[in-house]
């Protein structure tokens, strides 16, 4: 199970006291910002126990595996369900706490029920201030049961859950009808998804018999021990006032664990810590009892004495639970309750052992999880004990499991039995990745998903050149940052692969796939200028660069051109993708739009130094067309042209420009200025007779507009050659008075 | 969905007995208090009696105390109401109503079942 | 354990509002905020239209609003429709069972 514990502080008095605290005992938790473990997460849950809301609560980390929860203003700030979520992936767990007021109409005999499956649970509600109306009963949030208030027995109310199964699983609450939500009494019922003494999948494997009050974990056969015992069976109490899984955390405070509530992971729920016991865990242990809440009792033989926090305390000469075991008979000494190695390795185990008549090599013996019993090889003695050896044969993963190291003398015999976890040591199942490169180096991040188990130790870094027979170069790195690989040759492809290690002998990994990163090519250290440019219209723009001198071949694949338009904050690039190109002509630029021009070589993905950036401003596009252009023949030498103005014009028209040309004629056309532009009409004259001739037109107000519509009229007939058009302006209505 | 469904009624002489059961489907029944409610021809509702889920507690009307008996069989999800000595004035049609539980009313009520005490 | 009081009828024009009364005592409609109310048609089994004094369950028009003050709680039924015609009963919580009120008939003009 994961070691994850949820302190709640419940010295009443002052609710600004109050304090919720996370503590996890987990390798690496709560680092939250590495790859490694998730933050710790302490919260209230208001999903099922609604509360009045109030001021935000305060979450105070303290370092990297606690957190803490205050800022209570109001003991209803209190009530209601508090959960604290730790480890990471599928060890990701929640503990819950919940919390009732010690001032409700209705308090609970036991807040939480831990029940195998199939059992029948009953839950007991007090009655602390009566209320003559019926009592509800509800289950996670939702409508359970009712009961007469004068179904009480002995002033409580009992809710009997027969055969409960593992959806039963929740928060309960008893509330008079009419009763504030906050006066309820909240229990939580775990159910375990096993029968009695049973675990597993099919809950076919039995537990290993948890001492002091440990709860057998239904998934993995684990003893969730008490708060204050450590061992794979809960056989060992800790010093007082410590808790956690090996017994590390202590206690805050003068007074020890009073006046704490401890909560760890399902099946277990929450109790007082080992030596105290009542609603606020205030009141010691009486005469005979210890441990969590108080429930064990000692029942001491052979002189023994009992301790509250940790039972028995044996006289010389005996030792045992109740002190029933003579010294005489063998007992394994100091047997760490849980070993770890990495597949496939041979490690050794000690066991040692005393007793009278003293233990020798052959009376002590390991056993596996499936029954083989192992020899040892060899055995050093002491005064005081026996020390057997015993070289494991290679380990696979049906090896993970309890295995016992025995003892049997003609004094009697003693066992202990203690977990082994077989790990698989890590294998990246991705490539690491390129985050940059360049010429000489590759900057990498190592650290991909894998399988097997970690935590991560180490990871190493093997590269070489592509297609080499080399050795591999090995670089070590720290699993959480990025690697610089240096000193490398340009524009070479490169074989990277990771390999990772766990901790403890046989823990590295097999290398990961490989994956292949290229530096870059050396970088381009020609600074070009620029010669010159022209502007070809409103939008178009030629740029002419050059390039110093340099003896050798040019480094470089192409030019970059770019323009900046500040006004609009765009950049626009032009790719020119040959090194010998020293020209460039620009299209589909802004017309009227000051740009900053600058040119640069490009190599590969690298750029070299950029121009002296030279400013360009593009002349303004002209005014939209004039409209319905329309010609009339006047004589046998002149044409009447009439218009309407552009639409939407940006600014005054300075001037409009006529194109006048012989229909089918191969000349030039020949272009007429019409400079008093508040005119809508003019007559061209000094054309030739009976000529078909073609008309556009086209404002101007900075730069030249669009044209209009070409329209076509011909000249009267009398068969005079004139000596070419020319125009008269005057306002249409003159024209028409004529 | 909630179903409620009596049976029993009829007609019976004074002084004769009769009892009505009410089969309930669609929810936990061995969850909530149930009630009996009946209405004479033309009249008002009158509550009868009212049982809670466990059976240990019941209630009656003065009317009928001393000679009405409701139960309730959980296994069987059906309740009962077992009526003695009846008077003409008992002549009503019964309905039995589930008590909503966290929303203290008679949420749903059955199409009822007519009684008639006549000689 | 007497019935609470309530007006034997009350009419009103279509699109109208009418207002029922329904009077207790200390021991139910003024001790517990647990009254609902009714509505009934002839032969049928009764609907529940308010509950918790105020709330209608789903289902149930918003035309139908439900009030309480003091001993006395009241239903009001706004926009008056033909199909509102129907005998409606307020029944009250009075320690673990009920008490119904005598009835009204409510008739659209």
């Known amino acids: 199970a994961v070691d994850l514990t949820l302190l709640a502080n419940l010295r009443l008095t002052d609710p600004q006291r109050f304090f919720l605290t996370c503590v996890s005992g987990e390798a690496g938790a709560g680092r939250g910002s590495d790859a490694w473990g998730p933050p710790l997460l302490l919260e209230k849950d208001d999903r099922i126990v609604r509360t009045p809301p109030g001021p935000p609560l305060r979450l105070a980390r303290n370092g990297s595996h606690q957190v803490t929860l205050r800022g209570f203003s109001k003991p209803s700030d209190l009530v209601g369900v508090f959960s604290c979520v730790g480890g990471a992936g599928a060890r990701r767990t929640r503990v819950i706490y919940v919390h009732n007021s010690p001032g409700a109409h209705l308090l609970p005999d036991k807040v939480t029920h831990t029940v195998n499956k199939g059992d029948t649970a009953v839950l007991s509600a007090r009655v602390h201030k009566e209320k003559q109306t019926d009592v509800i009963w509800k289950s996670n949030g939702s409508y359970f049961y009712t009961l007469d208030w004068h179904e009480a027995q002995d002033g409580r109310f009992l809710l009997q859950l027969p055969n409960v199964q593992p959806p039963s699983s929740g928060i309960y609450s008893a509330t008079y009808l009419e009763a504030s939500p906050l006066g309820s009494a909240f229990f939580r019922l775990i159910v375990r998804g096993c029968g009695a003494g049973r675990w597993g999948p099919g809950c076919t494997k039995e537990c290993p018999g948890c001492l002091h009050g440990g709860v057998c974990h239904d998934h993995d056969g684990e003893c969730v021990c008490p708060p204050g015992f450590t061992g794979t069976r809960c056989e060992q109490a800790c010093r007082e006032g410590r808790f956690g899984q090996s017994c590390q955390e202590q206690c805050p405070g003068i007074s020890g664990c009073r006046g704490l509530t401890f909560c760890l992971p399902d099946p277990y729920g929450c109790s007082c810590g080992s030596g105290w016991r009542g609603s606020q865990c205030q009141e010691a242990c009486a005469p005979g009892h210890f441990g969590a809440d108080c429930r064990l009792q000692c029942q001491c033989q052979n002189g023994g004495t009992c301790d509250r926090f940790s039972g028995c305390v044996c006289p010389s000469g005996w030792h045992g639970v109740h002190c029933e075991k003579s010294d005489r008979i063998p007992q394994i000494l100091n047997m760490a309750s849980e070993l770890e190695f990495n597949l496939e390795t041979m490690p050794r185990i000690n066991c040692a052992a005393a007793g009278n008549p003293f233990p020798v090599r052959g009376s002590i013996e390991l056993r596996k999880p499936d029954g083989t019993v192992l020899l040892s090889t060899k055995a050093i003695v002491e005064p005081e004990k026996t020390t057997a050896e015993f070289e494991v044969p290679r380990l696979v993963l049906a090896d993970s499991g309890f295995w016992e190291c025995r003892v049997s003398t003609s004094g009697g015999q003693d066992s202990r039995r203690f977990k082994v976890n077989v790990k698989v040591p890590p294998v990246p199942l991705a490539a690491p990745r390129l985050l940059t490169k360049q010429s000489r180096q590759l900057v990498v991040s190592p650290l991909v998903s894998f399988s097997g188990d970690g935590p991560i130790s180490t990871v190493r870094l093997h590269y070489r050149p592509q297609d080499s027979t080399m050795d591999w170069s090995t670089i070590v790195v720290d699993p959480s940052e990025n690697v610089t690989l240096m000193n490398l040759r340009p524009k070479t492809g490169y074989s990277v692969r990771v390999q990772l290690s766990r901790p403890g002998e046989g823990g590295e990994g097999a290398w990961g796939p490989p994956t292949l990163m290229t530096t870059d090519c050396p970088e381009p250290l020609l600074q070009p200028w620029l010669e010159g440019w022209h502007v070809e219209g409103t939008d178009r723009l030629r740029v002419s660069w050059s390039l110093p001198l340099v003896p050798g071949p040019l480094v470089g694949d192409g030019f970059l051109l770019r323009l900046w338009d500040g006004t609009r904050g765009q950049e626009r690039r032009e790719n020119v993708s040959s090194p010998q190109a020293r020209t460039a002509l620009l299209t589909g630029l802004t017309p009227g739009t000051h740009y900053q021009l600058d040119v640069q070589l490009y190599h590969c993905t690298l750029l070299g130094p950029a121009s002296p950036p030279a400013h360009v401003l593009l002349p303004p596009s002209g005014p939209p067309a004039p409209r319905h252009l329309h010609a009339q023949a006047l004589s046998d030498s002149e044409i009447q042209l009439t218009w309407k103005h552009p639409e939407a014009l940006p600014g005054p028209i300075s001037k409009y420009v006529v194109e006048v040309q012989v229909a089918g004629g191969a000349g030039d056309p020949l272009w007429i200025d019409v400079d008093r532009p508040e005119e809508t009409s003019t007559i061209i004259r000094g054309l030739n007779a009976s000529t078909r001739y073609l008309f556009r037109m086209r404002a101007s107000i900075q730069g030249l507009g669009d044209w209009s519509n070409t329209v076509e009229e011909s000249t009267l007939g009398n068969g005079l050659q004139a000596e070419g058009p020319v125009q008269e302006s005057r306002a249409a209505e003159e024209g028409l008075d004529q | 969905e909630v179903q409620l469904l009596e049976s029993g009624g009829g007609l019976v002489q004074p002084g004769g007995s009769l009892r009505l059961s009410c089969a309930a489907s669609g929810f936990t029944f061995s969850s909530y208090k149930m009630i009996w409610v009946r209405q004479a021809p033309g009249k008002g509702l009158e509550w009868v009696s009212g049982i809670y889920p466990s059976g240990g507690a019941t209630g009656y009307a003065d009317s009928v105390k001393g000679r009405f008996t409701i139960s309730r069989d959980n296994s069987k999800n059906t309740l009962y109401l077992q009526m003695n000595s009846l008077r003409a004035e008992d002549t009503a049609t019964y309905y039995c109503?589930?008590?909503?539980?966290?929303?203290?009313?008679?949420?749903?009520w059955g199409q009822g079942t007519l009684v008639t005490v006549s000689s | 354990q007497s019935e609470l009081t309530q007006p034997r009828s009350v009419s009103g024009s279509l699109g109208q509002s009418v207002t029922i009364s329904c009077t207790g005592t200390t021991s139910d409609v003024g001790r517990y905020n647990f009254v609902s109310w009714y509505q009934q048609y002839p032969g049928r089994a009764p609907k529940l239209i308010i509950h918790d004094v105020t709330r209608r369950p789903s289902g149930v028009s918003d035309r139908f609003s439900g009030s309480k003050s003091g001993n006395t709680a009241s239903l009001t039924i706004s926009g008056l429709q033909a199909e509102d015609e129907a005998d409606y009963y307020c029944?009250?919580?009075?320690?673990?069972?009920?008490?119904f009120g005598s009835g009204t008939q409510v008739t659209v003009l």
């Open positions: 029944c009250s919580y009075a320690g673990s069972f009920y008490v």
């Open positions: 109503a589930r008590d909503g539980g966290d929303i203290v009313v008679p949420d749903y």
